[in-house]
């Protein structure tokens, strides 16, 4: 039985040209995390963090994606095209797969505030 829950940074906004941290946290389970995948709204993989093999950032995103903090991901030099959904997928044993969703809105406005809150999707 899957007892865990994924907490994410929820709906966040950030300034064009700025950076933002995408974070997910798996709680309420004793399952072992083996890998965390980060996907973009079009389901293309941005990065993988494997417990044994470390990080793999996909070449198309190497210039604008930084690993961490922790199992999270930092998106840099944001453009308007980065607006959309992002997914963290936690592969665990024995529970299976947990998935969290974050919605990022990139704002033109110079007064855009970076807002982030933890929430359970």
């Amino acid at each position: 039985m899957m007892t865990g829950t994924i907490e994410t940074t929820g709906n966040i906004s950030a300034k064009k040209g700025g950076s933002v941290i995408l974070q997910c946290h798996l709680s309420s389970t004793m399952a072992q995390v083996t890998q965390v995948n980060w996907e973009q709204h079009d389901h293309s993989l941005l990065a993988i963090r494997n417990a044994e093999l470390g990080w793999h950032i996909y070449p198309a995103f190497k210039d604008r994606v930084a690993p961490g903090p922790g199992l999270g991901l930092t998106l840099q030099s944001l453009t308007m095209n980065d607006t959309g959904e992002y997914f963290c997928t936690y592969h665990t044993y024995p529970d299976g797969t947990y998935r969290g969703r974050i919605f990022l809105e990139v704002l033109e406005s110079s007064v855009a505030e970076h807002s982030a809150r933890f929430q359970i999707p």
Epitope: V33, A51, E52, L53, G54, W55, A66, P67, L71
Partner: antibody, heavy 120, light 107 residues
Framework: EVKLVESGPELVKPGASMKISCKAS????????MNWVKQSHGKNLEWIGL????????SYNQKFKGKATLTVDKSSSTAYMELLSLTSEDSAVYYC?????????????WGQGTLVTVSS | DIQMTQSPASLSASVGETVTITCRAS??????LAWYQQKQGKSPQLLVY???TLAEGVPSRFSGSGSGTQFSLKINSLQPEDFGSYYC?????????FGGGTKLEIK
């Protein structure tokens, strides 16, 4: 206390194969990945590969594919590395090394090393 | 593969001196770097991980710094037991690679 105890020194002939063991104690053997590292001429360190004792899954440095085969025996908490078709280039000290923890991919624990000498 | 380049290859110093060893990565490894000390005939011992975090039991005279591609290990007030070889290793993504080592000798 975490301990990794490797088998003793070996003198082997060119073309032969051999197996080194690494007996783990002081922790749950299946819970931590085991790595193997080669040290040539008392200097250069090279990562050979790793094995997940829980499921036997392996990952190798491309350079050592076909040269090293990693296995485990869960019942005795022992990791093994078989070295194939040995040449003088394989003369080195070989270490087993354990990660600090999951997602912590530095080597917090090392075996004492096994000296392998390939000579006719 | 990521290449790790260490310098100097060797250095001589006296007890009480401060020395710095550097390590350069061929690409950005952020802060995913470890340092090890190895004495003659012994296994390497972890000193630092995540570029600057001291491993348990490591004296505070050791300090690691750097990020991206440039890193250093500083040893303040060298003690007799600090002499030996030092290696850096990236822990960003496999294959893990090590620097060529720095041999620290007593002057």
């Amino acid at each position: 206390e975490v301990k990794l105890v490797e088998s003793g020194p070996e003198l082997v002939k060119p073309g032969a194969s051999m197996k080194i063991s690494c007996k783990a104690s002081g922790y749950s053997f299946t819970g931590y990945t085991m790595n193997w590292v080669k040290q040539s001429h008392g200097k250069n360190l090279e990562w050979i590969g790793l094995i997940n004792p829980y499921n036997g899954g392996t990952s190798y440095n491309q350079k050592f594919k076909g040269k090293a085969t990693l296995t485990v025996d869960k019942s005795s908490s022992t990791a093994y590395m078989e070295l194939l078709s040995l040449t003088s280039e394989d003369s080195a000290v070989y270490y087993c090394a354990r990660y600090a923890n999951r997602f912590e991919n530095w080597f917090a624990y090392w075996g004492q090393g096994t000296l392998v000498t390939v000579s006719s | 593969d990521i290449q790790m380049t260490q310098s100097p290859a060797s250095l001589s110093a006296s007890v009480g001196e401060t020395v710095t060893i550097t390590c350069r990565a061929s690409e950005n490894i952020y802060s995913y770097l470890a340092w090890y000390q190895q004495k003659q005939g012994k296994s390497p011992q972890l000193l630092v991980y995540n570029a600057k975090t001291l491993a348990e039991g490591v004296p505070s005279r050791f300090s690691g710094s750097g990020s991206g591609t440039q890193f250093s290990l500083k040893i303040n007030s060298l003690q007799p037991e600090d002499f030996g070889s030092y290696y850096c290793q990236h822990h960003y993504g496999t294959p893990w690679t090590f620097g060529g080592g720095t041999k620290l000798e007593i002057k």
